[in-house]
């Protein structure tokens, strides 16, 4: 599944909105990491356009902020990317998923750095 700012034509929706989302997920990333958030729609069916919101402001896709169907990727994350992220139904602003993201100064420990 490719991410990017390319447009996608959407067909008919399968279902009306599902249940309210659960409590927010807390995620920690290292500086320079790619922040990846995923938000599959409730019930599995499309429900109109969606928007990712950070600290109350709608995110516009860019070279660093990549948006795909139900996914958000923020490349080369820095401390300024920390905050409250939500994926919302564009039309109603209903929150589908909610994330608390913290970007630490140190790179994440995902890579093996013991090889010196």
């Amino acid at each position: 599944e490719s991410l990017g700012t390319e447009q996608r034509v959407v067909g008919r929706a399968a279902e009306v909105p599902g249940p309210e989302p659960g409590q927010q997920e807390q995620l920690v990333f290292g500086s320079g990491d790619a922040v990846e958030l995923s938000c599959p729609p409730p019930g599995g069916g499309p429900m109109g356009p969606t928007v990712w919101v950070k600290d109350g402001t709608g995110l516009v896709p860019s070279e660093r902020v990549l948006v795909g169907p139900q996914r958000l990727q923020v490349l080369n994350a820095s401390h300024e990317d920390s905050g409250a992220y939500s994926c919302r139904q564009r039309l109603t602003q209903r929150v589908l998923c909610h994330f608390s993201v913290r970007v630490t100064d140190a790179p994440s420990s995902g890579d093996d750095e013991d090889g010196e």
Epitope: V9, G11, R12, A13, P17, V51, V60, R90
Partner: antibody, heavy 121, light 110 residues
């Protein structure tokens, strides 16, 4: 001040093509969702298509699906509607409409003055 | 025929209160917000009400919106001659994946 100025309308034969433009000013165009809405002479409003900034999605009314293509050029602050295989029933005034902020409930808060498309032989 | 149903006409005298209804279904009004637009003769539509009952700045508080179930209403109190116009309701429809408008109501101020 928000301004939307449509252009490109005119007389075209059935089966022909036309490209409408909507020049936007007074707001950060790339951050807003945009739609085309049309109104046949003496008739009501009909939503045609919408393009959504937040997820790059595009939607069309069934009546134009496969014939019309909506697009935007954020560097030119311009919204487009490419209309192919035009039919007599596509005759209408075409309005460009701006949606509210992405983090607010959707609504068409500003409209252009419209451009008339006439499909006739 | 429109997905959202409005009465084709309504009328009232100056100072009166008039109500315009908009009936839909669970795939639109029942699960989404309604907005209302005013179109004066020969002009582009103008946003009157959004999110069922919110008024944009500049819209007089004589205009109010409400919703119950799959129906919405626009009320205009203290009717004025300049209110004579066409009024449209609109909502997103999930089954059609697009916006739908009512057929419009022509308001005449007698």
């Amino acid at each position: 001040e928000v301004q939307l100025l449509e252009s490109g309308g005119g007389l075209v034969q059935p089966g022909g093509s036309l490209r409408l433009s909507c020049a936007a000013s007074g707001f950060t165009f790339s951050s807003y969702d945009m739609s085309w809405v049309r109104q046949a002479p003496g008739k009501g409003l009909e939503w045609v298509s919408g393009i959504y900034s937040g997820d790059g999605s595009i939607y069309y009314a069934d009546s134009v699906k496969g014939r019309f293509t909506i697009s935007r050029d954020n560097s030119k602050n311009t919204l487009y509607l490419q209309m192919n295989s035009l039919r007599a029933e596509d005759t209408a005034v075409y309005y460009c409409a701006k949606d509210g902020p992405m983090n607010e409930i959707s609504r068409f808060d500003y409209w252009g003055q419209g451009t008339l498309v006439t499909v006739s032989s | 025929q429109s997905v959202l149903t409005q009465p084709p006409s309504a009328s009232g005298t100056p100072g009166q209160r008039v109500t315009i209804s908009c009936s839909g279904s669970s795939s639109n009004i029942g699960n989404n917000y309604v907005s209302w637009y005013q179109q004066l003769p020969g002009t582009a539509p103008k946003l009157l009400i959004y999110a069922d009952s919110k008024r944009p700045s500049g819209v007089p508080d004589r205009f109010s919106g409400s919703k119950s179930g799959t129906s919405a209403s626009l009320a205009i109190s203290g009717l004025r001659s300049e209110d004579e116009a066409d009024y449209y309701c609109a909502s997103w429809d999930y089954s059609l994946s697009g916006y739908v408008f009512g057929g419009g109501t022509k308001l005449t101020v007698l």
